[in-house]
């Protein structure tokens, strides 16, 4: 399965939108930095069959979409930017879903690498717990925004490596 060129453009657009979503000076939020334990090893792309890598990417985008679709998120961010960001993520999910179906047929592998998917879910649980503990403060959201930008960058790099394998 070849992810369409529009997919990588959408990825870039999502990152740009996320960068634009900042509402407060992040310099006031240093003390709120937190170790979310991003599962970096799940995104190095070496140990995966392509179907598994795509499943992990799908989970990453799905969880990001869920995080930014909550009521608390709507209260934190500028609505039009949030809607555009969600639209980009939704389009990426569609692209990845089509690919997952295609790749599973070709490789005859299980739909997901369960451990990897679980690692991504637990990562987002830690993010949600952090936001709850910080009472969804503006700084907490800034820290999460920075973290998601970083994790989406890892996702983008994994997609580039997958394209090079084709």
């Amino acid at each position: 399965c070849d992810l369409p060129q529009t997919h990588s453009l959408g990825n870039r657009r999502a990152l740009i939108l996320l960068a634009q979503m900042g509402r407060i000076s992040h310099f006031s939020c240093l003390k709120d930095r937190h170790d979310f334990g991003f599962p970096e090893e799940e995104f190095d792309g070496h140990q995966f069959q392509k179907a598994q890598a795509i499943s992990v990417l799908h989970e990453m985008i799905q969880q990001t979409f869920n995080l930014f679709s909550t009521e608390d998120s709507s209260a934190a961010w500028e609505q039009s930017l949030l809607e555009k960001f969600s639209t980009e993520l939704y389009q990426q999910l569609n692209d990845l879903e089509a690919c997952v179906i295609q790749e599973v047929g070709v490789e005859e592998t299980p739909l997901m690498n369960e451990d990897s998917i679980l690692a991504v879910r637990k990562y987002f649980q830690r993010i949600t717990l952090y936001l709850t503990e910080k009472k969804y403060s503006p700084c907490a959201w800034e820290v999460v925004r920075a973290e998601i930008m970083r994790s989406l960058s890892f996702s983008t790099n994994l997609q580039k490596r997958l394209r090079r394998k084709d």
Partner: antibody
């Protein structure tokens, strides 16, 4: 390979202006902040200020606020430190260093080689 | 501003010695504390971040500990290339501040 390359040594007279640079390569320039640190001859390290190149937001140490200006041009992955009117007491080595921003990652993990600024009449 | 105070300001030691440098913050900084090494004419080099995490490529003889206001940098067995000046730095709030430095010299 991550690199921060600073502009060369400068010799200036009191009252003159100066702009020194720090060019980042080998990483996404807008994903990290760039900080500036002063080291006067034989002395310790003093943090001057920082910039987020993604939006050019800045923060300064109170000791340097109004004395210097930090800026960046993300299109050429370069940060700047400038003075409008130098004093003899500005004579020092100036370092730039990258900072991970709000991410949980090492602070100031890469440094420029330093720019020696000498101000003398 | 958060003041960072290092002790001692200088020390003499021999190759193979265990060396300990302390850093005290004027208020709690949790674990937002970094250690740097600087050799004459060179830029500082990050050794330890978040109080106890060893920076990639730094020898394991360097270790950091502490939280709140009191922190320690330990060199378990001093090597010839370790003679340098060491700085602590808090990274919990602006303005970021450094300790005054500890110079480690050959005995």
């Amino acid at each position: 390979e991550v690199q921060l390359v600073q502009s060369g040594a400068e010799v200036k007279k009191p009252g003159e202006s100066l702009k020194i640079s720090c060019k980042g390569s080998g990483y996404s320039f807008t994903s990290y902040w760039i900080g500036w640190v002063r080291q006067m001859p034989g002395k310790g390290l003093e943090w001057m200020g920082i910039i987020d190149p993604s939006d050019s937001d800045t923060a300064y140490s109170p000791s340097f606020q109004g004395q210097v200006t930090i800026s960046a041009d993300k299109s050429i992955s370069t940060a700047y430190l400038q003075w409008s009117s130098l004093k003899a007491s500005d004579t020092a080595m100036y370092y730039c260093a990258r900072h991970p921003g709000l991410n949980w990652a090492p602070d100031f993990d890469y440094w420029g080689q330093g720019t020696l600024v000498t101000v003398s009449s | 501003d958060i003041q960072m105070t290092q002790s001692p300001s200088s020390l003499s030691a021999s190759v193979g010695d265990r060396v300990t440098i302390t850093c005290r913050a004027s208020q709690s900084i949790a674990e937002f504390l970094n250690w740097y090494q600087q050799k004459p004419g060179k830029a500082p080099k990050l050794l330890i971040y978040f109080a106890s995490s060893l920076q990639s490529g730094v020898p394991s003889r360097f270790s950091g500990s502490g939280s709140g206001t009191d922190f320690t940098l330990t060199i378990s067995s001093l090597q010839p290339e370790d003679f340098a000046t060491y700085y602590c730095q808090q990274s919990i709030d602006f303005p970021l501040t450094f300790g005054q430095g500890t110079k480690v010299e050959i005995k």
